[in-house]
Amino acid sequence: DAHKSEVAHRFKDLGEENFKALVLIAFAQYLQQCPFEDHVKLVNEVTEFAKTCVADESAENCDKSLHTLFGDKLCTVATLRETYGEMADCCAKQEPERNECFLQHKDDNPNLPRLVRPEVDVMCTAFHDNEETFLKKYLYEIARRHPYFYAPELLFFAKRYKAAFTECCQAADKAACLLPKLDELRDEGKASSAKQRLKCASLQKFGERAFKAWAVARLSQRFPKAEFAEVSKLVTDLTKVHTECCHGDLLECADDRADLAKYICENQDSISSKLKECCEKPLLEKSHCIAEVENDEMPADLPSLAADFVESKDVCKNYAEAKDVFLGMFLYEYARRHPDYSVVLLLRLAKTYETTLEKCCAAADPHECYAKVFDEFKPLVEEPQNLIKQNCELFEQLGEYKFQNALLVRYTKKVPQVSTPTLVEVSRNLGKVGSKCCKHPEAKRMPCAEDYLSVVLNQLCVLHEKTPVSDRVTKCCTESLVNRRPCFSALEVDETYVPKEFNAETFTFHADICTLSEKERQIKKQTALVELVKHKPKATKEQLKAVMDDFAAFVEKCCKADDKETCFAEEGKKLVAASQAALGL
């Protein structure tokens, strides 16, 4: 349905508050270095313009596309060239190339200062003094650091952020009330950002079909009672929503997401019995709730898959005439029967099935050729099962910190060229799979673990893409979306790596380590561990453990000393010498 003025249409659909918030998010995700005040000014200008279009859709420029309007506005920023360099060249292009250009310049790791949380009283004062500015600043700071954050979901986070301050700034113990809520929002926010980044990478690097396949598998697990046609409709709509958000079309995305939530709730009887509670909530909570809803129960007495996908005489005809439909049905039927499998495993099985049909259907006896196709699935299923079993055992034996360290060593040996901060960040996140997933029963472990690992490895892939240093990482990241984890798992020690020159400065520590939080102290030690492996990639687990134990003792000792700085200087030299000797450096 064509509208005379797209900007008026979206303003009316979303309302002023959401319109302004989404435009701010869009601008902050494109121009990540611009000051808050500059963005607020641009947003206000766009909002005033939108209001003129609501009043008269035929007014000048109201018929322009949102990309044209927003791009023109972004290109008015005076400091574009000096702040963003070649991104300024985007402004010389016409739409749609200009928007594509802006998208290509989004930075997953922007050079921005770490967000330091002020004192609770300071935050509460700022919140009370100007609630609107305080919340806008939250949107701005998150959006610029997470340029692919799912915009409608960020509105939900902002709503919760506001609720936390509204409640806790009146509490007797403000800090006890507020800080856990902020920690929870921060951790959930990081997880949400990473999950959305994978969706965007899937769409942008592997295409719409890859995303749709993922969505068919996931929605079929979640809504196993829904018919294939219903799942297909939801997949089409969900793909449109995420394509829009990943493409910077945040107003359309938020609007379409609301429409999808409305449709799901109006048709919940034919979708899932688990949606009732979600559908009673207000819009933002409703959409979030639907996205996180638990899997419905599987229908009883589902027939064997073999009848339609192995034994039927029409298998090859159906495959050849409409691969998307036939393989989509295969994926749907397999996924709804297997909530215990990861989505990526289901996609591997579907790919194996497809490859077998492609190989067999032109043969003299196609059925004989593909009759044992389901047997080919067994090793594919067992591989992640065994890996998860082994790693959960290791996690239970070591605990999270030491499990992370084991992964740090493992991944540094696999891809030592990757920057130390990236290896630390990614390995720490990989290590969190233990506490996140190993507590689950067998039936929930694989979907939890392997799909989480896909999200974390995508972080490695997007960070590495910015400054590629390892052909092995590039290969695992680009060859197959669903085989990224097996590809990284299969990597052995990189024998071509030339060990890094020893630099004592890397292993010099100061008294400031004593005032760090436990998390920050862990990161310091893990950074040292990565550097150690880069210097001595052939070091054994035992050697590394001994050095790290000595290091932990050294930090503990010097943090208890009266003259901490002297202790770090003198004992540090001894530790470096002892470590070099222990590792044969």
């Epitope: 090859c316 495959y319 005439e321 409409a322 439909v325 492609e358 067999c360 032109a362 043969a363 003299a364």
Partner: antibody, heavy 119, light 110 residues
Amino acid sequence: EVQLLESGGGLVQPGGSLRLSCAVSGIDLSNYAINWVRQAPGKCLEWIGIIWASGTTFYATWAKGRFTISRDSTTVYLQMNSLRAEDTAVYYCARTVPGYSTAPYFDLWGQGTLVTVSS
Amino acid sequence: DIVMTQSPSSVSASVGDRVTITCQSSPSVWSNFLSWYQQKPGKAPKLLIYEASKLTSGVPSRFKGSGSGTDFTLTISCLQPEDFATYYCGGGYSSISDTTFGCGTKVEIK
């Protein structure tokens, strides 16, 4: 040596019919998929259809109804009915690369046979 | 409707030149089902590349295929006298009935 050899081309009047043959030697035809592809003078290649080793056939959307592919033990046939001037082209038979069924990978081709539809 | 657009329709080049031919498909091809053929006057086409980037046995390594989804490229890195010919891309889709070829790029001597 593996060879595909088309025959049966020639001049035919609009509305007429023609049956082309593709004689296959050097391989056991019962194990391979064979396609028909045509090329109008100075124009694009155009896929007509395929017959799998099992005898199952598929056709380009535009070719359904007027064109029929069949086979015996050593020869693949293309039956063309209700011919029109725009069917004038060189007609090739071509083998699909073994191990594929629906992919457009044709590794062995005949030399082609010219069909002219004119009154 | 399936549309496969090859560009340029012709290119003049000299021996030793690098030549790039593009093939754009709408919609995207199925699972990188994209091939490149070489055809010389009066001859049948010859398969050079399949699965977008895999070289057929016996084809010189100066031929390189790349791309995925909707955009594909054939690059001849160092043109040889025997490379002057017409090049076609071929695409496979969700339905076998949609198998389509591009309309060719003629590589001529400058």
